[in-house]
């Protein structure tokens, strides 16, 4: 005997109570594949979750996090608190970045300022809690008597070819 359920398309379920007739998914449920014997309950985006995509008979609802939170996990299963720039989230809440570190995002951790001297450069713009330092030319390039401009080419006497 052929299984009639395999003919039931997405958005329906195979109703064994009605001789394997394909019945539409009830309200607030869906089936994303054919041949299903039940429909799955739609996800509800409540509280800290907000609806990004409504549930349909063939696909589940998709949630996002409300302002002040960001999504984590597959299909936004969790909402984690945002912090301000210049802060990081700790187990006790949002805390300012320590001196010498910065965070330019609403999530993630405070990271150390770039050490310009490791690249032989100097600090052009100081770092803040929200911004990394900006590295500039090396200290040698800025020493007195040194010029960042290209020196002029030496004058040539007429009739002489360049060396």
């Amino acid at each position: 005997l052929q299984d009639l359920c395999s003919n039931c398309p997405a958005g329906t379920f195979c109703d064994n109570n009605r001789s394997q007739i394909c019945s539409p998914c009830p309200p607030n449920s869906f089936s994303s594949a054919g041949g299903q014997r039940t429909c799955d309950i739609c996800r509800q985006c409540k509280g800290v979750f907000k609806t990004r995509k409504e549930c349909s008979s063939t696909s589940n609802a998709e949630c996002d996090c409300i302002s002040g939170y960001h999504c984590l996990g597959a299909e936004c299963s969790m909402c984690e608190q945002d912090c301000k720039q210049g802060q990081e989230l700790t187990k006790k809440g949002c805390k300012d970045c320590c001196f010498g570190t910065f965070n330019d995002q609403k999530r993630g951790i405070c990271r150390p300022w770039t050490n310009c001297s490791l690249d032989g450069k100097s600090v052009l713009v100081n770092g803040t809690k929200e911004r990394d330092v900006v590295c500039g030319p090396s200290p040698a390039d800025l020493s007195p008597g040194a010029s960042s401009a290209t020196p002029p080419a030496p004058a040539r006497e007429p009739g002489h070819s360049p060396q």
Epitope: H70, L72, M78, E80, E88, L89, T90, K91, R107, G108, I109
Partner: nanobody, 119 residues
Framework: QVQLVESGGGLVHPGGSLRLSCAAS????????MSWVRQAPGKGLEWVSD????????DYADSVKGRFTISRDNAKSTLYLQMNSLKPEDTAVYYC????????????WGQGTQVTVSS
Amino acid sequence: QVQLVESGGGLVHPGGSLRLSCAASGFIFSLYTMSWVRQAPGKGLEWVSDINSGGDSTDYADSVKGRFTISRDNAKSTLYLQMNSLKPEDTAVYYCAKDYPLGQREDYWGQGTQVTVSS
């Protein structure tokens, strides 16, 4: 890769107890501080407790202090949360985490275990 699998959740009456477990693999468990965090229905993530790598230092959120006990068995790479005197407001999905906040390490938490406290 890092894998964290929680178990032990369920439905319990107010005042009851549950013991959650988290089996860890894919990293050297004994080197890391481990945390439990939870997400109550419609609420954001909340840090619950953590325990240092050796298991001799623990910390708890004020809301669970005196009722919950975190522990670990480094030989079994397993983290535990003993939950006593449970209240309806403890209803949540509980996640075991290798790092907190979770957003810093996208793969360092488990799938969660549902705890429902209801009469």
